[in-house]
Interface confidence: medium
């Protein structure tokens, strides 16, 4: 029986019964989060031979080997992967060996075997026989091989039963468990699989076969399975499906998406039966089974039943996620909110076309409309009373519409209306008229020159910085004293600053009027002496951090068309000095010989600069008596040391010798310090570990059903 679309067995080990009749799992297999140790010996699934996606095992208490569960699992195809991996074994507390002695092929993807404190028989498996490339395999934090004492069948009796291969210049026997060898096919078979009796399978077989050179006797297919036969490509009028079998059009038309109950059914594209058109393609009509290329980004049409969609919160904006065409009218009324600009961009940033009108009113939280970053066409098929298709009324903090240097917006029909937007300069509105092609449509009262921009510095001069000085947590800057036509018009300056890892910030980035302005603001009074340049000391900054800074002059009276004349600087990027790092993290120590300790730690969370070296101090402690209480000749009685808890892979440490013999009588000396590249690699490794663990947790922890 083909099972799927992915089987998730969690919490209750008896759910394993769902695998009873499965020969192929079309999809993934998760076995996870079974916290009560159970006896798995009565569970055996000899029918299961293929998993088309991946196998994930995570925190299954009491499970000591996979060999009894899946004695005939031969192929994991890796058609879809779990974070680049086709086999993941993570935090399996009791697993002693993998034991998948019939596993012959992982077609795509790597393996990740991590933090399994009791897991042995890892160094005895030659993964290169199973995977095409082993370089991406990640096997760390398991039981150290020195404590495992892995013995392949027959080696104790000096009648070794398993074959040898070379891994990392080590020629050794290859096995899965103490009584199961790793199967290898004769070299005469080349890349082909073989039977249990070492006869070569048909070239289209994968993993194994029940009879030699027979494409109907394969355990799994190298390419595709069709009507009981392994074929190199799907026959005419059949289509690839789920990466492993061929189906006909009738099958594809009738199958029901396992993931989405409201999808439009499967499609046929490029010889494949798939759930949705691939990226860059769209269905050729809503009931069509075929795909055509999109022109530009693929459209997603969203429609509002009531014609007008009111955006008054992040929740209401969420409904528009992914929409490129909005059929209807948009009424934006954002009075408050947290981090509103970036949230709106996230949910509305793909909208390109609005078929009706756009009305923005009482949106005191908005500083800019740049969150509609792809809007290029307002059709104006429906208009407000007075024939308005773009209406902006009473937005107390709106300062920018869009960045017109990088924006092409057309309003096909209807007029624009602007009133009571005190911080929106009329020049900005006039610029919009030109860009959108609405110039000449508006009548005199449609753009109110009195109450738009009445509280903004609309004609700006440029302020120039004159000096900058930095320390580890301070920046001192000064700038030219601004001289408006009437000196009494100048009230003060406002300095804006924020952390800026990259030199790509703009004044309105992530800015709204509800405190989610990502800029910090400091007011600077005018120096009493007219000849002294204004300046400020910014303190409480982070060491070795790049900041963006700009300054605005705050001016008073109405001049030139009743508008304030103001001034502001360009954005300046400046880095603070380095400082003392925070303490190193996760210090661990272990002994790898009678005269050596290996100490391992992670870099500090706040390096505060480029780290150049560490200082390690140590002192002698009294000997621990428990070390004498064990018989080290008895394999089973070796105590698990503190570092075999799935948190440190000691082999990783001992691979590189820590001492080397120096010339003459010098004796041993310290290993060379790590290069920058090595340090960077370690940093990336630690980051990668965290990212994977986060991905794992985010993928598998789901809310309990109601």
């Amino acid at each position: 029986e083909i099972c799927g679309p992915g089987i998730d067995i969690r919490n209750d080990y008896q759910q394993l019964k769902r695998l009873e009749n499965c020969t192929v799992i079309e999809g993934y297999l998760h076995i996870l989060l079974i916290s009560k140790a159970e006896d798995y010996r009565s569970y055996r699934f000899p029918k299961l031979t293929v998993i088309t996606e991946y196998l994930l095992l995570f925190r299954v208490a009491g499970l000591e080997s996979l060999g009894d569960l899946f004695p005939n699992l031969t192929v994991i195809r890796g058609w879809k992967l779990f974070y680049n991996y086709a086999l993941v074994i993570f935090e399996m507390t009791n697993l002693k060996d993998i034991g998948l002695y019939n596993l012959r092929n992982i077609t795509r993807g790597a393996i990740r075997i991590e933090k399994n404190a009791d897991l042995c028989y890892l160094s005895t498996v030659d993964w290169s026989l199973i995977l095409d490339a082993v370089s991406n395999n990640y096997i760390v934090g398991n039981k150290p091989p020195k404590e495992c004492g892995d013995l392949c069948p027959g080696t104790m009796e000096e009648k070794p039963m398993c074959e040898k291969t070379t891994i990392n210049n080590e020629y050794n026997y290859r096995c899965w468990t103490t009584n199961r060898c790793q199967k290898m096919c004769p070299s005469t078979c080349g890349k082909r699989a073989c039977t249990e009796n070492n006869e070569c399978c048909h070239p289209e077989c994968l993993g194994s076969c029940s009879a030699p050179d027979n494409d109907t006797a394969c355990v799994a297919c190298r390419h595709y399975y069709y009507a009981g036969v392994c074929v190199p490509a799907c026959p005419p009028n059949t289509y690839r499906f789920e990466g492993w079998r061929c189906v006909d059009r009738d099958f594809c038309a009738n199958i029901l998406s396992a993931e989405s109950s409201d999808s439009e059914g499967f499609v046929i594209h490029d010889g494949e039966c798939m759930q949705e058109c691939p990226s860059g393609f769209i269905r050729n009509g809503s009931q069509s089974m075929y795909c055509i290329p999109c022109e530009g980004p693929c459209p997603k049409v969203c429609e509002e039943e009531k014609k007008t969609k009111t955006i008054d919160s992040v929740t209401s904006a969420q409904m528009l996620q992914g929409c490129t065409i909005f059929k209807g009218n948009l009424l934006i009324n954002i009075r408050r909110g947290n981090n509103i600009a970036s949230e709106l961009e996230n949910f509305m940033g793909l909208i390109e076309v609005v078929t009706g009108y756009v009305k923005i009113r009482h949106s005191h939280a908005l500083v800019s409309l740049s969150f509609l970053k792809n809007l290029r066409l307002i059709l104006g098929e429906e208009q407000l009373e007075g024939n308005y298709s773009f209406y902006v009324l009473d937005n107390q903090n709106l300062q920018q519409l869009w960045d017109w240097d990088h924006r092409n917006l057309t309003i096909k029909a209807g007029k624009m209306y602007f009133a009571f937007n005190p911080k929106l300069c009329v020049s900005e509105i006039y610029r919009m008229e030109e860009v959108t092609g609405t110039k000449g449509r508006q009548s005199k009262g449609d753009i109110n020159t009195r109450n738009n921009g009445e509280r903004a510095s609309c004609e700006s001069d440029v302020l120039h910085f004159t000096s900058t000085t930095t320390s580890k947590n301070r920046i001192i800057i000064t700038w030219h004293r601004y001289r408006p036509p009437d000196y009494r018009d100048l009230i003060s300056f406002t300095v804006y600053y924020k952390e800026a890892p990259f030199k790509n910030v703009t004044e309105y980035d992530g800015q709204d009027a509800c405190g989610s302005n990502s800029w910090n603001m400091v007011d600077v009074d005018l120096p009493p002496n007219k000849d002294v340049e204004p300046g400020i000391l910014l303190h409480g900054l982070k060491p070795w951090t790049q900041y963006a800074v700009y300054v605005k002059a705050v001016t008073l009276t109405m001049v030139e068309n009743d508008h304030i004349r103001g001034a502001k600087s360009e954005i300046l990027y400046i880095r603070t000095n380095a400082s003392v790092p925070s303490i190193p993290l996760d210090v661990l120590s272990a002994s790898n010989s009678s005269s050596q300790l290996i100490v391992k730690w992670n870099p500090p969370s706040l390096p505060n600069g480029n780290l150049s070296y560490y200082i390690v101090r140590w002192q002698r402690q009294p000997q621990d008596g428990y070390l004498y209480r064990h018989n080290y000749c008895s394999k089973d009685k070796i105590p698990i040391r503190k570092y075999a808890d799935g948190t440190i892979d000691i082999e990783e440490v001992t691979e590189n010798p820590k001492t080397e013999v120096c010339g003459g009588e010098k004796g041993p000396c310290c290993a060379c310090p790590k290069t920058e590249a090595e340090k960077q690699a370690e940093k990336e490794e630690a980051e990668y570990r965290k990212v994977f663990e986060n991905f794992l947790h985010n993928s598998i922890f789901v809310p309990r059903p109601e």
Epitope: E1, I2, C3, G4, P5, T23, E26, Y226, A227, G228, V247, D248, D250, F251, N254, I255, L256, S257, A258, S261
Partner: antibody, heavy 116, light 107 residues
Framework: QIQLVQSGPELKKPGETVKISCKAS????????LNWVKQAPGEGLKWMGW????????TYAEEFKGRFVFFLETSASTAYLQINNLSDEDTATYFC??????????????WGAGTS | DIQMTQTTSSLSASLGDKVTISCRAS??????LNWYQQKPDGTIKLLIY???RLHSGIPSRFSGSGSGTDYSLTISNLEQEDIATYFC?????????FGGGTKVEIK
């Protein structure tokens, strides 16, 4: 076109054996599951089980274990239902019906005309 | 086994009427509910699968709805050719089971 053609009506005595055939045409038999459904006179439909046309493995509903046998003649694109040791309760129309080898598609989209 | 109950064994309606047939499962069947039509000559065909999806070639006057344990089939505009017995079937848990059927006749 796609169809399942069933053999004609049968008249049997209690204790005898009957073999009903279901021939697939217009599609490849091995790509779809083949189900058997019973309808006693004046009654509803009862699913008897199915045969995996890839492997030949039958699955029987509890009530139909024992005397009922599903098997295939793949070369002739034909599935068979054999009932041994017939009794009066076996008087019914037997339908073959096609299902898809796909976990979320638990329905029968092509039916034979039935054999009584 | 999951029991499927069609409470109305037969109903009479006029041509052009809207007809609704209901079906109840003994437990939640997660929308895996299918509808079949059996004509007086005994031929059976699939109308709707997965609660509301119209099988190819079936007229749009047929529609399905429901969730959990309660489901229904609606014929929006009854035609002469719709005279038949309608069966529901659950596809949630083996063995698949059918309802007893609802016979639709013309008044």
């Amino acid at each position: 076109q796609i169809q399942l053609v069933q053999s004609g009506p049968e008249l049997k005595k209690p204790g005898e054996t009957v073999k009903i055939s279901c021939k697939a045409s217009g599609y490849n038999l091995a790509n779809y599951g083949l189900n058997w459904v019973k309808q006693a006179p004046g009654e509803g439909l009862k699913w008897m089980g199915w045969i995996n046309t890839n492997t030949g493995a039958p699955t029987y509903a509890e009530e139909f274990k024992g005397r009922f046998v599903f098997f295939l003649e793949t070369s002739a694109s034909t599935a068979y239902l054999q009932i041994n040791n017939l009794s009066d309760e076996d008087t019914a129309t037997y339908f073959c019906a096609r299902s898809i080898y796909y976990y979320a598609s638990r329905y029968f989209n092509v039916w034979g005309a039935g054999t009584s | 086994d999951i029991q499927m109950t069609q409470t109305t064994s037969s109903l009479s309606a006029s041509l052009g009427d809207k007809v609704t047939i209901s079906c109840r499962a003994s437990q939640d069947i997660s929308n895996y509910l299918n509808w079949y039509q059996q004509k007086p000559d005994g031929t059976i065909k699939l109308l709707i699968y997965y609660t509301s999806r119209l099988h190819s070639g079936i007229p749009s006057r047929f529609s399905g709805s429901g969730s959990g344990t309660d489901y229904s089939l609606t014929i929006s505009n009854l035609e002469q050719e719709d005279i038949a017995t309608y069966f529901c079937q659950q596809g949630n848990t083996l063995p698949w089971t059918f309802g007893g059927g609802t016979k639709v006749e013309i008044k």
